[in-house]
Protein backbone atom coordinates (compact mmCIF):
# COMPACT_ATOMS: atom_id res chain seq x y z
CA UNK A 1 0.00 0.00 0.00
CA UNK A 2 2.67 2.46 1.07
CA UNK A 3 4.76 1.76 -2.01
CA UNK A 4 1.77 2.36 -4.26
CA UNK A 5 1.05 5.64 -2.50
CA UNK A 6 4.71 6.65 -2.79
CA UNK A 7 4.66 5.80 -6.46
CA UNK A 8 1.49 7.85 -7.01
CA UNK A 9 2.84 10.81 -5.05
CA UNK A 10 6.14 10.71 -6.90
CA UNK A 11 4.25 10.74 -10.17
CA UNK A 12 1.89 13.56 -9.17
CA UNK A 13 4.46 15.96 -7.74
CA UNK A 14 6.59 16.03 -10.89
CA UNK A 15 6.46 19.47 -12.55
CA UNK A 16 5.18 18.49 -15.97
CA UNK A 17 1.96 18.84 -17.90
CA UNK A 18 -0.81 16.62 -16.53
CA UNK A 19 0.20 16.37 -12.86
CA UNK A 20 -1.66 17.87 -9.88
CA UNK A 21 1.52 19.67 -8.87
CA UNK A 22 2.03 21.28 -12.28
CA UNK A 23 -1.50 22.66 -12.52
CA UNK A 24 -1.23 24.37 -9.12
CA UNK A 25 2.36 25.36 -9.72
CA UNK A 26 1.73 27.25 -12.98
CA UNK A 27 -1.07 29.29 -11.38
CA UNK A 28 -1.61 29.03 -7.68
CA UNK A 29 -5.15 28.05 -6.75
CA UNK A 30 -4.67 29.77 -3.40
CA UNK A 31 -5.60 33.40 -2.92
CA UNK A 32 -2.51 35.23 -1.76
CA UNK A 33 -2.75 38.57 0.02
CA UNK A 34 -0.06 41.02 0.95
CA UNK A 35 -0.93 43.27 3.87
CA UNK A 36 1.11 46.40 4.51
CA UNK A 37 1.52 48.36 7.72
CA UNK A 38 3.17 51.75 7.21
CA UNK A 39 5.25 53.34 9.96
CA UNK A 40 3.93 56.89 10.19
CA UNK A 41 6.58 59.18 11.73
CA UNK A 42 5.08 61.34 14.47
CA UNK A 43 7.98 63.71 15.19
CA UNK A 44 9.84 64.51 11.94
CA UNK A 45 11.03 67.98 13.01
CA UNK A 46 12.43 66.83 16.36
CA UNK A 47 14.36 64.06 14.66
CA UNK A 48 15.79 66.36 12.01
CA UNK A 49 16.65 69.21 14.37
CA UNK A 50 17.65 67.35 17.56
CA UNK A 51 18.44 63.80 16.46
CA UNK A 52 15.62 62.58 18.73
CA UNK A 53 14.37 59.02 18.73
CA UNK A 54 12.00 58.46 15.82
CA UNK A 55 8.45 57.98 17.08
CA UNK A 56 6.50 55.73 14.75
CA UNK A 57 2.91 54.59 14.70
CA UNK A 58 1.98 51.70 12.43
CA UNK A 59 -1.07 52.16 10.23
CA UNK A 60 -2.64 49.27 8.42
CA UNK A 61 -3.43 46.79 7.15
CA UNK A 62 -3.58 47.96 3.55
CA UNK A 63 -4.21 44.81 1.58
CA UNK A 64 -3.38 43.78 -1.98
CA UNK A 65 -4.11 40.60 -3.83
CA UNK A 66 -0.85 39.25 -5.26
CA UNK A 67 0.51 36.18 -7.05
CA UNK A 68 -2.67 35.80 -9.09
CA UNK A 69 -0.84 35.69 -12.43
CA UNK A 70 0.22 32.45 -14.04
CA UNK A 71 3.89 31.75 -14.55
CA UNK A 72 5.13 32.86 -17.96
CA UNK A 73 7.55 31.43 -20.53
CA UNK A 74 7.26 27.99 -18.94
CA UNK A 75 9.83 25.89 -20.79
CA UNK A 76 10.75 22.26 -20.11
CA UNK A 77 14.30 21.10 -20.73
CA UNK A 78 14.24 17.33 -21.16
CA UNK A 79 18.02 17.19 -21.26
CA UNK A 80 18.67 18.39 -17.72
CA UNK A 81 15.16 17.72 -16.33
CA UNK A 82 14.43 21.32 -15.51
CA UNK A 83 11.63 23.75 -16.14
CA UNK A 84 12.24 27.47 -16.48
CA UNK A 85 9.76 30.28 -15.98
CA UNK A 86 9.14 33.91 -15.11
CA UNK A 87 6.96 34.82 -12.13
CA UNK A 88 4.98 37.91 -13.14
CA UNK A 89 4.26 40.54 -10.51
CA UNK A 90 0.87 42.07 -10.00
CA UNK A 91 -0.96 43.72 -7.12
CA UNK A 92 -4.63 44.65 -6.84
CA UNK A 93 -5.78 46.83 -3.96
CA UNK A 94 -8.52 45.28 -1.78
CA UNK A 95 -10.45 48.15 -0.14
CA UNK A 96 -12.68 45.82 1.88
CA UNK A 97 -9.61 44.27 3.55
CA UNK A 98 -7.94 47.62 4.22
CA UNK A 99 -8.24 50.33 6.86
CA UNK A 100 -8.16 53.12 4.30
CA UNK A 101 -7.46 53.93 0.67
CA UNK A 102 -4.36 54.09 -1.48
CA UNK A 103 -4.65 57.89 -1.22
CA UNK A 104 -3.99 57.87 2.55
CA UNK A 105 -1.03 60.07 3.52
CA UNK A 106 1.97 59.06 5.60
CA UNK A 107 4.99 60.88 6.97
CA UNK A 108 7.98 58.74 6.10
CA UNK A 109 11.69 59.07 5.56
CA UNK A 110 12.56 60.79 2.28
CA UNK A 111 13.74 57.76 0.32
CA UNK A 112 15.65 59.76 -2.29
CA UNK A 113 17.47 61.94 0.24
CA UNK A 114 18.51 58.94 2.35
CA UNK A 115 19.58 56.91 -0.68
CA UNK A 116 21.43 59.68 -2.54
CA UNK A 117 23.38 60.75 0.53
CA UNK A 118 24.45 57.13 1.00
CA UNK A 119 25.31 56.41 -2.63
CA UNK A 120 27.18 59.68 -3.21
CA UNK A 121 29.52 59.93 -0.25
CA UNK A 122 31.90 62.40 -1.91
CA UNK A 123 31.78 65.59 0.17
CA UNK A 124 31.72 67.98 -2.78
CA UNK A 125 28.96 65.97 -4.46
CA UNK A 126 27.03 66.03 -1.18
CA UNK A 127 27.11 69.84 -1.29
CA UNK A 128 25.59 69.67 -4.75
CA UNK A 129 22.95 67.25 -3.42
CA UNK A 130 22.31 69.70 -0.59
CA UNK A 131 21.62 72.45 -3.11
CA UNK A 132 19.22 70.27 -5.08
CA UNK A 133 17.46 69.05 -1.93
CA UNK A 134 16.95 72.63 -0.82
CA UNK A 135 15.95 73.89 -4.26
CA UNK A 136 13.32 71.15 -4.53
CA UNK A 137 12.08 71.97 -1.00
CA UNK A 138 12.78 68.39 0.04
CA UNK A 139 13.62 67.40 3.58
CA UNK A 140 14.65 64.42 5.70
CA UNK A 141 11.02 63.32 5.88
CA UNK A 142 8.23 63.61 3.36
CA UNK A 143 4.47 63.11 3.14
CA UNK A 144 3.47 60.50 0.57
CA UNK A 145 0.33 58.57 -0.28
CA UNK A 146 0.31 54.80 0.10
CA UNK A 147 0.20 54.41 -3.68
CA UNK A 148 3.21 56.67 -4.13
CA UNK A 149 5.23 55.04 -1.37
CA UNK A 150 4.68 51.49 -2.62
CA UNK A 151 4.44 51.82 -6.37
CA UNK A 152 6.37 54.96 -7.19
CA UNK A 153 6.35 58.74 -7.56
CA UNK A 154 8.46 61.29 -9.39
CA UNK A 155 10.85 62.68 -6.84
CA UNK A 156 11.32 66.47 -7.05
CA UNK A 157 14.91 66.37 -5.78
CA UNK A 158 16.04 63.62 -8.15
CA UNK A 159 14.36 65.47 -11.00
CA UNK A 160 16.94 68.23 -10.54
CA UNK A 161 19.97 65.92 -10.55
CA UNK A 162 21.98 66.70 -13.67
CA UNK A 163 23.14 63.11 -14.10
CA UNK A 164 21.01 60.52 -15.88
CA UNK A 165 19.30 59.00 -12.80
CA UNK A 166 15.95 57.30 -12.36
CA UNK A 167 13.70 60.02 -11.01
CA UNK A 168 10.87 57.68 -10.01
CA UNK A 169 11.12 56.28 -6.50
CA UNK A 170 9.00 53.71 -4.69
CA UNK A 171 9.66 50.84 -2.33
CA UNK A 172 8.36 48.33 -4.87
CA UNK A 173 8.89 50.35 -8.03
CA UNK A 174 8.68 48.98 -10.66
CA UNK A 175 6.21 46.20 -9.79
CA UNK A 176 3.12 45.80 -11.98
CA UNK A 177 4.04 44.54 -15.48
CA UNK A 178 7.37 43.21 -14.26
CA UNK A 179 8.44 39.65 -13.54
CA UNK A 180 10.80 37.87 -11.19
CA UNK A 181 13.25 35.43 -12.70
CA UNK A 182 14.11 33.66 -14.94
CA UNK A 183 13.95 30.73 -12.52
CA UNK A 184 15.12 27.31 -13.67
CA UNK A 185 14.01 24.53 -11.31
CA UNK A 186 14.31 20.77 -11.35
CA UNK A 187 11.09 19.14 -12.52
CA UNK A 188 11.72 15.93 -10.57
CA UNK A 189 11.38 13.57 -13.52
CA UNK A 190 14.71 11.88 -12.96
CA UNK A 191 14.99 12.46 -9.23
CA UNK A 192 11.92 13.34 -7.20
CA UNK A 193 14.04 14.46 -4.25
CA UNK A 194 15.14 17.45 -6.35
CA UNK A 195 11.69 18.56 -7.50
CA UNK A 196 11.14 22.35 -7.34
CA UNK A 197 14.72 22.94 -6.20
CA UNK A 198 16.18 25.95 -7.98
CA UNK A 199 18.97 25.13 -10.40
CA UNK A 200 19.61 28.71 -11.55
CA UNK A 201 18.15 32.18 -10.98
CA UNK A 202 18.64 34.78 -13.70
CA UNK A 203 20.94 32.30 -15.40
CA UNK A 204 23.28 31.89 -12.43
CA UNK A 205 23.78 29.51 -9.51
CA UNK A 206 25.00 32.37 -7.33
CA UNK A 207 23.64 35.81 -6.55
CA UNK A 208 26.83 37.93 -6.63
CA UNK A 209 25.60 39.87 -3.60
CA UNK A 210 27.39 38.00 -0.83
CA UNK A 211 30.65 36.24 -0.13
CA UNK A 212 31.10 32.49 0.21
CA UNK A 213 28.14 30.19 0.98
CA UNK A 214 25.85 33.17 1.70
CA UNK A 215 25.76 33.81 -2.04
CA UNK A 216 24.32 30.41 -2.91
CA UNK A 217 20.81 29.89 -4.25
CA UNK A 218 19.56 27.06 -2.06
CA UNK A 219 16.39 25.01 -2.09
CA UNK A 220 13.05 25.89 -3.62
CA UNK A 221 11.02 29.11 -3.75
CA UNK A 222 9.08 27.88 -0.65
CA UNK A 223 5.85 27.25 -2.56
CA UNK A 224 6.65 23.55 -2.38
CA UNK A 225 9.41 21.19 -1.32
CA UNK A 226 10.40 17.70 -2.42
CA UNK A 227 7.89 15.14 -1.08
CA UNK A 228 8.10 13.09 2.11
CA UNK A 229 9.22 15.93 4.34
CA UNK A 230 10.67 14.87 7.70
CA UNK A 231 10.40 16.89 10.89
CA UNK A 232 14.15 16.69 11.31
CA UNK A 233 14.79 18.43 7.98
CA UNK A 234 16.05 21.95 7.60
CA UNK A 235 14.09 23.35 4.67
CA UNK A 236 16.16 25.66 2.50
CA UNK A 237 14.52 28.18 0.22
CA UNK A 238 15.42 31.26 -1.77
CA UNK A 239 13.53 34.54 -1.49
CA UNK A 240 14.24 37.20 -4.08
CA UNK A 241 12.51 39.75 -1.81
CA UNK A 242 15.36 39.50 0.66
CA UNK A 243 18.07 38.73 -1.91
CA UNK A 244 19.20 35.58 -0.14
CA UNK A 245 18.54 31.96 0.66
CA UNK A 246 17.25 31.18 4.12
CA UNK A 247 15.91 28.17 5.99
CA UNK A 248 13.05 26.97 8.16
CA UNK A 249 12.94 24.38 10.93
CA UNK A 250 10.07 22.25 12.26
CA UNK A 251 8.09 23.81 15.08
CA UNK A 252 4.81 21.94 15.53
CA UNK A 253 2.10 19.71 14.08
CA UNK A 254 -0.88 21.71 12.87
CA UNK A 255 -4.29 20.60 11.60
CA UNK A 256 -5.21 22.71 8.59
CA UNK A 257 -8.80 22.14 7.45
CA UNK A 258 -8.51 18.49 8.41
CA UNK A 259 -5.12 18.06 6.76
CA UNK A 260 -2.17 17.26 9.03
CA UNK A 261 0.65 19.71 8.21
CA UNK A 262 4.05 20.48 9.64
CA UNK A 263 4.63 24.05 10.71
CA UNK A 264 8.13 25.17 9.81
CA UNK A 265 9.37 28.52 11.08
CA UNK A 266 12.32 30.80 10.41
CA UNK A 267 14.35 30.50 13.61
CA UNK A 268 15.94 33.45 15.40
CA UNK A 269 19.30 31.77 14.70
CA UNK A 270 18.86 32.63 11.00
CA UNK A 271 18.97 36.32 11.94
CA UNK A 272 21.74 36.04 14.54
CA UNK A 273 25.09 37.81 14.38
CA UNK A 274 28.18 35.81 13.38
CA UNK A 275 29.15 35.91 17.06
CA UNK A 276 26.20 33.64 17.85
CA UNK A 277 25.88 31.91 14.47
CA UNK A 278 29.25 31.77 12.68
CA UNK A 279 27.52 30.68 9.44
CA UNK A 280 26.16 34.21 9.14
CA UNK A 281 29.59 35.85 8.87
CA UNK A 282 29.14 36.42 5.14
CA UNK A 283 25.87 38.30 5.62
CA UNK A 284 27.81 40.97 7.50
CA UNK A 285 29.03 43.21 4.70
CA UNK A 286 30.35 46.25 6.58
CA UNK A 287 31.75 46.98 10.02
CA UNK A 288 30.37 50.37 11.07
CA UNK A 289 26.57 50.01 11.03
CA UNK A 290 26.88 46.38 12.18
CA UNK A 291 29.14 47.45 15.07
CA UNK A 292 31.84 45.08 13.93
CA UNK A 293 29.30 42.38 13.02
CA UNK A 294 27.84 42.23 16.53
CA UNK A 295 24.46 43.74 15.60
CA UNK A 296 21.84 41.26 14.46
CA UNK A 297 18.36 41.01 13.04
CA UNK A 298 18.89 43.35 10.09
CA UNK A 299 20.22 42.44 6.67
CA UNK A 300 21.98 45.02 4.50
CA UNK A 301 20.74 44.30 0.96
CA UNK A 302 22.15 47.48 -0.60
CA UNK A 303 24.23 45.46 -3.06
CA UNK A 304 21.00 43.98 -4.38
CA UNK A 305 19.30 47.40 -4.56
CA UNK A 306 21.77 49.38 -6.72
CA UNK A 307 23.52 50.72 -3.64
CA UNK A 308 20.40 52.10 -1.99
CA UNK A 309 20.78 51.54 1.78
CA UNK A 310 17.90 49.07 2.19
CA UNK A 311 17.90 46.88 5.29
CA UNK A 312 15.54 43.95 5.68
CA UNK A 313 14.39 42.75 9.07
CA UNK A 314 11.46 41.00 10.67
CA UNK A 315 8.54 43.28 11.57
CA UNK A 316 9.08 45.56 14.56
CA UNK A 317 12.72 44.39 14.60
CA UNK A 318 11.74 40.99 15.99
CA UNK A 319 14.93 39.00 16.77
CA UNK A 320 17.04 42.16 16.27
CA UNK A 321 19.69 43.48 18.64
CA UNK A 322 18.68 46.29 21.04
CA UNK A 323 21.00 48.81 19.36
CA UNK A 324 18.95 48.52 16.15
CA UNK A 325 15.59 49.38 17.72
CA UNK A 326 16.93 51.75 20.40
CA UNK A 327 16.55 54.93 18.26
CA UNK A 328 12.96 53.99 17.29
CA UNK A 329 10.00 54.43 19.64
CA UNK A 330 6.65 52.70 19.09
CA UNK A 331 7.74 49.18 18.12
CA UNK A 332 6.23 46.10 19.76
CA UNK A 333 7.70 42.89 18.36
CA UNK A 334 5.96 39.60 19.05
CA UNK A 335 6.58 36.18 17.54
CA UNK A 336 2.96 35.29 16.84
CA UNK A 337 2.34 38.33 14.64
CA UNK A 338 5.78 38.97 13.23
CA UNK A 339 7.56 35.71 12.47
CA UNK A 340 7.44 33.81 9.19
CA UNK A 341 6.03 30.30 8.96
CA UNK A 342 5.24 27.67 6.34
CA UNK A 343 2.62 24.95 6.83
CA UNK A 344 3.77 22.04 4.72
CA UNK A 345 1.83 18.91 3.90
CA UNK A 346 4.65 16.38 4.45
CA UNK A 347 3.68 13.71 1.92
CA UNK A 348 3.51 15.98 -1.11
CA UNK A 349 5.81 18.71 0.19
CA UNK A 350 3.24 21.33 -0.80
CA UNK A 351 3.03 24.53 1.24
CA UNK A 352 -0.68 24.73 2.01
CA UNK A 353 -0.54 27.79 4.22
CA UNK A 354 2.11 30.39 4.85
CA UNK A 355 2.75 33.78 6.38
CA UNK A 356 5.79 35.59 5.06
CA UNK A 357 6.57 38.62 7.18
CA UNK A 358 9.29 41.16 6.59
CA UNK A 359 10.07 44.79 7.23
CA UNK A 360 11.67 47.27 4.85
CA UNK A 361 14.02 49.77 6.48
CA UNK A 362 16.29 52.48 5.13
CA UNK A 363 19.56 53.64 6.61
CA UNK A 364 20.00 57.36 7.06
CA UNK A 365 23.28 58.83 8.24
CA UNK A 366 24.42 62.25 9.39
CA UNK A 367 25.99 64.41 6.69
CA UNK A 368 27.97 67.57 7.37
CA UNK A 369 27.27 68.83 3.86
CA UNK A 370 23.53 68.11 3.62
CA UNK A 371 21.66 70.56 5.80
CA UNK A 372 18.59 68.39 6.40
CA UNK A 373 20.86 65.61 7.74
CA UNK A 374 23.38 67.87 9.43
CA UNK A 375 21.95 67.78 12.96
CA UNK A 376 21.79 64.01 13.17
CA UNK A 377 24.12 62.66 15.82
CA UNK A 378 23.75 58.97 14.92
CA UNK A 379 22.83 56.51 12.22
CA UNK A 380 19.22 55.38 12.04
CA UNK A 381 17.86 52.23 10.43
CA UNK A 382 14.42 53.67 9.79
CA UNK A 383 11.43 51.33 9.50
CA UNK A 384 9.28 52.30 6.51
CA UNK A 385 6.77 49.46 6.43
CA UNK A 386 6.24 45.83 7.22
CA UNK A 387 4.30 43.31 5.23
CA UNK A 388 2.49 40.07 5.82
CA UNK A 389 2.04 37.92 2.73
CA UNK A 390 -0.35 35.07 3.41
CA UNK A 391 -1.99 32.24 1.56
CA UNK A 392 -4.19 29.40 2.72
CA UNK A 393 -5.52 26.47 0.73
CA UNK A 394 -9.18 27.04 -0.16
CA UNK A 395 -11.93 24.82 1.30
CA UNK A 396 -12.64 23.14 -2.05
CA UNK A 397 -8.99 22.38 -2.65
CA UNK A 398 -8.62 21.17 0.93
CA UNK A 399 -11.48 18.71 0.43
CA UNK A 400 -9.88 17.47 -2.77
CA UNK A 401 -6.55 17.17 -1.01
CA UNK A 402 -8.07 15.22 1.88
CA UNK A 403 -9.87 12.81 -0.38
CA UNK A 404 -7.05 12.26 -2.86
CA UNK A 405 -3.96 12.43 -0.65
CA UNK A 406 -4.27 12.32 3.12
CA UNK A 407 -7.52 10.32 3.11
CA UNK A 408 -5.97 7.56 1.03
CA UNK A 409 -3.00 7.31 3.38
CA UNK A 410 -4.99 7.30 6.58
Amino acid sequence: GDLLIQKTIKKQVVLEEGTIAFKNWVKTGTEVYRQFWIFDVQNPQEVMMNSSNIQVKQRGPYTYRVRFLAKENVTQDAEDNTVSFLQPNGAIFEPSLSVGTEADNFTVLNLAVAAASHIYQNQFVQMILNSLINKSKSSMFQVRTLRELLWGYRDPFLSLVPYPVTTTVGLFYPYNNTADGVYKVFNGKDNISKVAIIDTYKGKRNLSYWESHCDMINGTDAASFPPFVEKSQVLQFFSSDICRSIYAVFESDVNLKGIPVYRFVLPSKAFASPVENPDNYCFCTEKIISKNCTSYGVLDISKCKEGRPVYISLPHFLYASPDVSEPIDGLNPNEEEHRTYLDIEPITGFTLQFAKRLQVNLLVKPSEKIQVLKNLKRNYIVPILWLNETGTIGDEKANMFRSQVTGKIN
Epitope: V125, I128, N130, S131, N134, K135, Y163, E368
Partner: antibody
Framework: QVQLQQSGAELVKPGASVKLSCKAS????????MHWVKQRPGQGLEWIGE????????NYNQKFKGKATLTVDKSSSTAYMQLSSLTSEDSAVYYC?????????WGQGTTLTVSS | DIVMTQSQKFLSTSVGDRVSVTCKAS??????VAWYQQKPGQSPKVLIY???YRYSGVPDRFTGSGSGTDFTLTVSNVQSEDLAEYFC?????????FGAGTKLELK
Protein backbone atom coordinates in the same frame (compact mmCIF):
# COMPACT_ATOMS: atom_id res chain seq x y z
CA GLN B 1 18.99 84.20 -11.43
CA VAL B 2 22.02 83.85 -9.13
CA GLN B 3 23.96 87.09 -8.71
CA LEU B 4 27.09 87.66 -6.62
CA GLN B 5 28.28 91.17 -6.01
CA GLN B 6 31.81 91.27 -4.62
CA SER B 7 33.36 94.30 -2.95
CA GLY B 8 35.67 96.62 -4.87
CA ALA B 9 39.42 96.46 -5.28
CA GLU B 10 41.55 96.93 -2.17
CA LEU B 11 45.01 98.34 -1.75
CA VAL B 12 46.38 97.55 1.72
CA LYS B 13 49.69 97.67 3.52
CA PRO B 14 51.66 94.57 4.55
CA GLY B 15 50.73 93.32 8.03
CA ALA B 16 47.22 94.77 7.85
CA SER B 17 43.92 92.88 7.58
CA VAL B 18 41.11 93.17 5.06
CA LYS B 19 37.52 91.96 4.91
CA LEU B 20 36.15 91.12 1.48
CA SER B 21 32.41 90.78 0.94
CA CYS B 22 30.19 88.84 -1.43
CA LYS B 23 26.50 89.80 -1.53
CA ALA B 24 24.25 87.09 -2.92
CA SER B 25 20.87 87.52 -4.57
CA UNK B 26 18.51 85.52 -6.78
CA UNK B 27 18.55 82.44 -4.58
CA UNK B 28 18.08 81.38 -0.95
CA UNK B 29 21.42 82.34 0.53
CA UNK B 30 21.32 79.87 3.42
CA UNK B 31 20.59 76.90 1.16
CA UNK B 32 23.91 76.65 -0.63
CA UNK B 33 27.48 76.33 0.64
CA MET B 34 29.71 79.25 -0.31
CA HIS B 35 33.29 78.70 -1.51
CA TRP B 36 36.20 81.10 -1.82
CA VAL B 37 38.98 80.76 -4.39
CA LYS B 38 42.23 82.70 -4.84
CA GLN B 39 43.83 83.46 -8.21
CA ARG B 40 47.27 84.97 -8.50
CA PRO B 41 48.39 86.17 -11.94
CA GLY B 42 49.81 83.22 -13.86
CA GLN B 43 49.43 80.96 -10.79
CA GLY B 44 46.17 79.15 -11.44
CA LEU B 45 43.42 78.80 -8.86
CA GLU B 46 43.66 77.89 -5.18
CA TRP B 47 40.74 76.78 -3.04
CA ILE B 48 40.62 78.66 0.27
CA GLY B 49 37.59 77.17 2.01
CA GLU B 50 33.84 76.81 2.26
CA UNK B 51 31.10 77.91 4.62
CA UNK B 52 27.55 76.71 5.23
CA UNK B 53 25.53 79.94 5.56
CA UNK B 54 22.78 78.15 7.48
CA UNK B 55 24.95 77.67 10.57
CA UNK B 56 28.31 79.34 9.73
CA UNK B 57 30.17 76.04 9.81
CA UNK B 58 33.38 76.50 7.80
CA ASN B 59 36.09 74.21 6.45
CA TYR B 60 39.47 75.51 5.33
CA ASN B 61 42.33 74.49 3.15
CA GLN B 62 45.11 73.81 5.67
CA LYS B 63 47.27 76.28 3.77
CA PHE B 64 44.85 79.16 4.55
CA LYS B 65 44.12 78.29 8.20
CA GLY B 66 45.08 81.33 10.25
CA LYS B 67 45.16 83.45 7.12
CA ALA B 68 41.47 83.42 6.09
CA THR B 69 38.34 83.57 8.23
CA LEU B 70 34.98 82.94 6.60
CA THR B 71 31.78 84.38 8.03
CA VAL B 72 28.26 85.18 6.86
CA ASP B 73 25.52 87.65 7.66
CA LYS B 74 22.24 85.87 6.94
CA SER B 75 20.16 89.04 7.29
CA SER B 76 21.93 90.68 4.35
CA SER B 77 22.72 87.46 2.44
CA THR B 78 26.38 88.36 2.48
CA ALA B 79 29.45 86.17 2.83
CA TYR B 80 32.70 87.61 4.12
CA MET B 81 36.33 86.59 4.05
CA GLN B 82 38.79 88.28 6.36
CA LEU B 83 42.46 87.99 5.45
CA SER B 84 44.99 88.83 8.14
CA SER B 85 48.75 89.52 8.41
CA LEU B 86 48.86 90.41 4.75
CA THR B 87 51.97 90.00 2.64
CA SER B 88 52.68 90.46 -1.06
CA GLU B 89 51.88 86.73 -1.46
CA ASP B 90 48.26 87.60 -0.70
CA SER B 91 48.00 89.93 -3.68
CA ALA B 92 45.48 88.19 -5.91
CA VAL B 93 41.93 88.13 -7.21
CA TYR B 94 39.54 86.48 -4.73
CA TYR B 95 36.33 84.87 -5.92
CA CYS B 96 33.26 83.71 -4.04
CA UNK B 97 31.16 80.91 -5.57
CA UNK B 98 28.13 79.11 -4.14
CA UNK B 99 27.71 75.41 -4.85
CA UNK B 100 24.76 74.51 -7.01
CA UNK B 101 25.62 71.99 -9.74
CA UNK B 102 29.19 72.57 -8.66
CA UNK B 103 31.10 75.84 -8.70
CA UNK B 104 28.90 77.11 -11.48
CA UNK B 105 28.31 80.73 -10.45
CA TRP B 106 31.32 82.86 -9.56
CA GLY B 107 31.39 86.43 -8.38
CA GLN B 108 33.25 88.94 -10.52
CA GLY B 109 36.20 88.80 -8.12
CA THR B 110 37.85 91.28 -5.80
CA THR B 111 41.41 92.38 -6.59
CA LEU B 112 43.57 92.71 -3.49
CA THR B 113 46.90 94.45 -3.77
CA VAL B 114 49.26 94.32 -0.80
CA SER B 115 51.91 96.96 -1.11
CA SER B 116 53.68 99.44 1.09
CA ASP C 1 47.12 67.28 -1.41
CA ILE C 2 46.26 65.99 -4.87
CA VAL C 3 48.27 67.73 -7.56
CA MET C 4 46.53 68.34 -10.89
CA THR C 5 49.16 68.70 -13.62
CA GLN C 6 48.33 70.46 -16.87
CA SER C 7 51.58 69.92 -18.72
CA GLN C 8 50.71 72.17 -21.68
CA LYS C 9 50.95 75.79 -20.58
CA PHE C 10 49.89 76.93 -24.09
CA LEU C 11 48.17 75.17 -26.96
CA SER C 12 48.21 76.66 -30.45
CA THR C 13 45.20 75.99 -32.63
CA SER C 14 43.27 77.34 -35.60
CA VAL C 15 39.56 78.02 -35.97
CA GLY C 16 37.84 74.81 -37.04
CA ASP C 17 40.54 72.58 -35.53
CA ARG C 18 40.10 69.91 -32.89
CA VAL C 19 42.25 70.35 -29.78
CA SER C 20 42.74 68.34 -26.59
CA VAL C 21 43.71 69.78 -23.21
CA THR C 22 45.08 67.18 -20.81
CA CYS C 23 45.21 66.97 -17.05
CA LYS C 24 46.89 64.38 -14.84
CA ALA C 25 46.01 63.78 -11.18
CA SER C 26 48.72 62.69 -8.74
CA UNK C 27 46.38 59.96 -7.45
CA UNK C 28 43.14 58.28 -8.43
CA UNK C 29 40.25 60.76 -8.33
CA UNK C 30 37.65 58.56 -10.02
CA UNK C 31 35.54 60.80 -12.23
CA UNK C 32 35.43 63.65 -9.72
CA VAL C 33 36.85 66.23 -12.10
CA ALA C 34 35.48 69.49 -13.48
CA TRP C 35 36.75 71.72 -16.29
CA TYR C 36 36.52 75.51 -16.32
CA GLN C 37 36.99 78.15 -18.99
CA GLN C 38 38.30 81.59 -18.12
CA LYS C 39 38.55 84.52 -20.46
CA PRO C 40 40.74 87.55 -19.63
CA GLY C 41 39.14 89.80 -17.03
CA GLN C 42 36.31 87.34 -16.39
CA SER C 43 35.60 84.79 -13.69
CA PRO C 44 35.85 81.06 -14.47
CA LYS C 45 32.86 79.26 -15.99
CA VAL C 46 32.19 75.56 -15.55
CA LEU C 47 32.12 73.49 -18.75
CA ILE C 48 32.26 69.89 -17.59
CA TYR C 49 31.59 68.10 -14.29
CA UNK C 50 32.02 64.45 -13.33
CA UNK C 51 34.76 64.23 -15.97
CA UNK C 52 32.35 63.88 -18.89
CA TYR C 53 29.02 65.62 -18.20
CA ARG C 54 28.52 68.85 -20.08
CA TYR C 55 27.11 71.69 -18.01
CA SER C 56 23.80 73.05 -19.28
CA GLY C 57 24.20 75.64 -22.00
CA VAL C 58 27.75 74.55 -22.88
CA PRO C 59 28.13 73.92 -26.63
CA ASP C 60 28.47 70.25 -27.57
CA ARG C 61 31.84 70.86 -29.20
CA PHE C 62 33.24 70.64 -25.64
CA THR C 63 33.72 67.04 -24.52
CA GLY C 64 35.27 65.68 -21.34
CA SER C 65 36.69 62.20 -20.88
CA GLY C 66 38.86 60.14 -18.59
CA SER C 67 38.81 58.58 -15.16
CA GLY C 68 41.30 57.67 -12.47
CA THR C 69 44.30 59.91 -13.11
CA ASP C 70 44.11 60.98 -16.77
CA PHE C 71 41.58 63.47 -18.05
CA THR C 72 41.03 65.27 -21.34
CA LEU C 73 38.96 68.21 -22.44
CA THR C 74 38.44 68.13 -26.20
CA VAL C 75 37.26 71.12 -28.18
CA SER C 76 36.21 70.08 -31.67
CA ASN C 77 35.67 72.70 -34.36
CA VAL C 78 37.37 75.43 -32.32
CA GLN C 79 35.68 78.85 -32.52
CA SER C 80 37.36 82.18 -31.90
CA GLU C 81 35.34 82.61 -28.68
CA ASP C 82 36.96 79.41 -27.34
CA LEU C 83 40.36 81.11 -27.11
CA ALA C 84 40.72 81.24 -23.34
CA GLU C 85 42.44 79.56 -20.43
CA TYR C 86 41.19 76.11 -19.31
CA PHE C 87 41.55 74.71 -15.81
CA CYS C 88 40.85 71.24 -14.50
CA UNK C 89 39.74 70.73 -10.89
CA UNK C 90 39.47 67.61 -8.72
CA UNK C 91 36.84 67.29 -6.02
CA UNK C 92 37.58 63.75 -4.95
CA UNK C 93 39.52 64.85 -1.86
CA UNK C 94 39.87 67.95 0.26
CA UNK C 95 41.41 70.39 -0.28
CA UNK C 96 39.91 70.93 -3.71
CA UNK C 97 42.76 71.51 -6.16
CA PHE C 98 43.06 73.01 -9.63
CA GLY C 99 45.47 72.58 -12.49
CA ALA C 100 47.74 75.50 -13.37
CA GLY C 101 45.79 76.13 -16.56
CA THR C 102 46.27 75.74 -20.33
CA LYS C 103 45.94 78.77 -22.62
CA LEU C 104 44.37 78.12 -25.99
CA GLU C 105 45.80 80.58 -28.53
CA LEU C 106 45.73 81.09 -32.28
CA LYS C 107 48.61 79.70 -34.34
Amino acid sequence: QVQLQQSGAELVKPGASVKLSCKASGYTFTSYWMHWVKQRPGQGLEWIGEIDPSDSHANYNQKFKGKATLTVDKSSSTAYMQLSSLTSEDSAVYYCAPIYYGLDNWGQGTTLTVSS
Amino acid sequence: DIVMTQSQKFLSTSVGDRVSVTCKASQNVGTNVAWYQQKPGQSPKVLIYSASYRYSGVPDRFTGSGSGTDFTLTVSNVQSEDLAEYFCQQYNNYPLTFGAGTKLELK
